[in-house]
């Protein structure tokens, strides 16, 4: 009956962690004697090719300084405990501790048997490192030029992580890769870039990081912060301002980052009705008169700049009863 070596074609282990390279001689055959088990690295330099051996009488040996006896062990193989007990070598699974990048490569598990001769199997050990991810907004000020508004960093992954962004904005990503502080790892940085405007401020975009060490992609939300001058509009005019009306109000509605530092109400005619009183973002009208037939201007200032809005007012002789009856306010 033919025997074969059962190994995994590929084994993945975490950098710094412990990995087992399974190796079994199958099937169990009465009278098949395993005289020696060896692990080799065929692609390594000549003096580092012999990784481990298990002699039924002498037990395990680990000759090469890399990985070395302090980082290697046979999981199940047992040597003969006395002259009357057989060694158990059918399971030659090798454990490798404190994985380094240099441990990556092909490993050959070989059983020297009698009378079948030598049989072997090969495993590719991949060393991976789980990256640490972070994403953050960059405080930017509006401009006409594309600017990085968010960063997503996947630190010290092996292989490098794949970063993408989920957003409805008009954007592009710029990626850089640098060596991590841990040998063999890579830190990936993705810059979310757009022309920063008020439309982007407060918008949440999502950084998506994919890596084979993750069960599912990491999704990191980032709320953008764009400093921009006030974007102003005026509300409260209902096209039903008439002489003598006493319940009218204009509101200066503002989107800005940072918050407004000042509001200024004026008219384009230069004449400001005495019955109109500015109270911050509101203009309270005590009584509408003919001077209100003008254009009101609200000018808002913040740390970045200023914005303004105009509202044309038409004063009627009498109330417009055909309207919805809305009252400004």
């Amino acid at each position: 009956q033919d025997v074969r070596v059962q190994v995994l074609p590929e084994v993945r282990g975490q950098l710094g962690g412990t990995v087992e390279l399974p190796c079994h001689l199958l099937p169990p055959v009465p009278g098949l004697y395993i005289s020696l088990v060896t692990w080799q690295r065929p692609d390594a330099p000549a003096n580092h090719q012999n990784v481990a051996a298990f002699h039924p009488k002498m037990g395990p040996s680990f000759p090469s300084p890399k990985p070395g006896s302090e980082r290697l062990s046979f999981v199940s193989a047992k040597q003969s405990t006395g002259q009357d007990t057989e060694a158990e070598l059918q399971d030659a699974t090798l454990a490798l501790h404190g994985l380094t990048v240099e441990d990556e490569g092909n490993y050959t598990c070989e059983f020297a048997t009698f009378p079948k001769g030598s049989v072997r199997g090969m495993t590719w050990l991949r060393v991976i490192a789980k990256p640490k991810n972070q994403a953050e907004a960059q405080k930017v000020t509006f401009s006409q030029d594309p600017t990085t508004v968010a960063l997503c960093i996947s630190k010290e992954g092996r292989p490098p992580a794949r970063i993408s962004w989920l957003s409805s904005l008009d954007w592009e990503a710029k990626e850089t890769q640098v060596s991590g502080t841990l040998a063999g790892t890579v830190t990936v940085t993705s810059r979310f870039t757009l022309v920063p405007s008020g439309r982007a401020d407060g918008v949440t975009v999502t950084c998506k990081v994919e890596h084979e060490s993750f069960e599912e992609p990491a999704l990191i939300p980032v709320t953008l912060s764009v400093r921009y001058p006030p974007e102003v509009s005026i509300s409260g005019y209902d096209d039903n301002w008439y002489l003598g009306r006493t319940d009218a109000t204009l509101s200066c509605d503002v989107r800005s980052n940072p918050e407004p530092t000042g509001y200024d109400w004026s008219t384009t005619s230069g004449t400001f009705p005495t019955s109109a009183v500015a109270q911050g973002s509101q203009l309270v009208i005590h009584a509408v008169d003919s001077l209100f037939n003008t254009t009101f201007v609200c000018t808002v200032t913040n740390a970045v700049g200023m914005g303004r809005a105009e509202q044309v007012i038409f004063v009627r002789e009498t109330p417009n009863t055909a309207g919805a009856g809305a009252t400004g306010g």
Epitope: Y33, S35, A53, H55, M58, Q83, E86, G117, S118
Partner: antibody, heavy 116, light 107 residues
Framework: QVQLVQSGAEVKKPGSSVKVSCKAS????????IHWVRQPPGKGLEWIGA????????NYNQKFQGRVTITAVTSTSTAYMELSSLRSEDTAVYYC?????????WGQGTTVTVSS | DIVMTQSPSTLSASVGDRVSVTCKAS??????VVWYQQKPGQPPKTLIY???YRYSGVPDRFTGSGSGTDFTLTISSLQAEDLAEYFC?????????FGQGTKLEIK
């Protein structure tokens, strides 16, 4: 401790047969192959064959196939190597040996002289 | 059968010398090679297994190297007690085969 004790020296005529014994002690006889290796005077080593006492399975070097029979008797923990149609070039020291990783345990050797 | 060709057949050296014995296999045997030492009137003793692994109790002046078809046994500093014959053996393929031996003499 493991011991392999072989029978004494033999002088044989060409064409005859010789049967050399090897009594084992100090381990489970049925669990290990017993091998036979010979060494002609002033020459190298030559593997003849082996027997597995656990099931009497045997395995031979093709060079000796048909002339050699290797057997084991579990009740006495003894292995035997019988070589027939002897010729002068069969003159050698015959060793029984136990394979534990390598040939780690050897009998003291039995000198077989084939001479007319 | 795999032929193990050993050289030299005789080697004469002085105490303290570094000496090497080579063994060439007629086909690839991986690292499945043993080196034995045999003193007159005694059976062989294992020095090296799996081409480069030193057997228990063997002085570290004995080292083995090689893989595939070319193997070397080196004694880094020859001692008087190393007077013996040295054999290589492959166990990669049945039948096991031995080199013809190297007789080491002390000058």
């Amino acid at each position: 401790q493991v011991q392999l004790v072989q029978s004494g020296a033999e002088v044989k005529k060409p064409g005859s047969s010789v049967k050399v014994s090897c009594k084992a002690s100090g381990y489970i006889f049925t669990s290990y192959w017993i091998h036979w290796v010979r060494q002609p005077p002033g020459k190298g080593l030559e593997w003849i064959g082996a027997v597995y006492p656990g099931n009497s399975d045997s395995n031979y070097n093709q060079k000796f196939q048909g002339r050699v029979t290797i057997t084991a008797v579990t009740s006495t923990s003894t292995a035997y190597m019988e070589l027939s149609s002897l010729r002068s070039e069969d003159t050698a020291v015959y060793y029984c040996t136990k394979l534990v990783g390598t040939f780690d345990y050897w009998g003291q050797g039995t000198t077989v002289t084939v001479s007319s | 059968d795999i032929v193990m060709t050993q050289s030299p057949s005789t080697l004469s050296a002085s105490v303290g010398d570094r000496v090497s014995v080579t063994c060439k296999a007629s086909q690839n045997v991986g690292i499945n090679v043993v080196w034995y030492q045999q003193k007159p009137g005694q059976p062989p003793k294992t020095l090296i297994y799996s081409a480069s692994y030193r057997y228990s109790g063997v002085p570290d002046r004995f080292t083995g190297s090689g893989s595939g078809t070319d193997f070397t046994l080196t004694i880094s500093s020859l001692q008087a007690e190393d007077l013996a014959e040295y054999f290589c053996q492959q166990y990669n393929t049945n039948p096991f085969t031995f080199g013809q031996g190297t007789k080491l003499e002390i000058k």
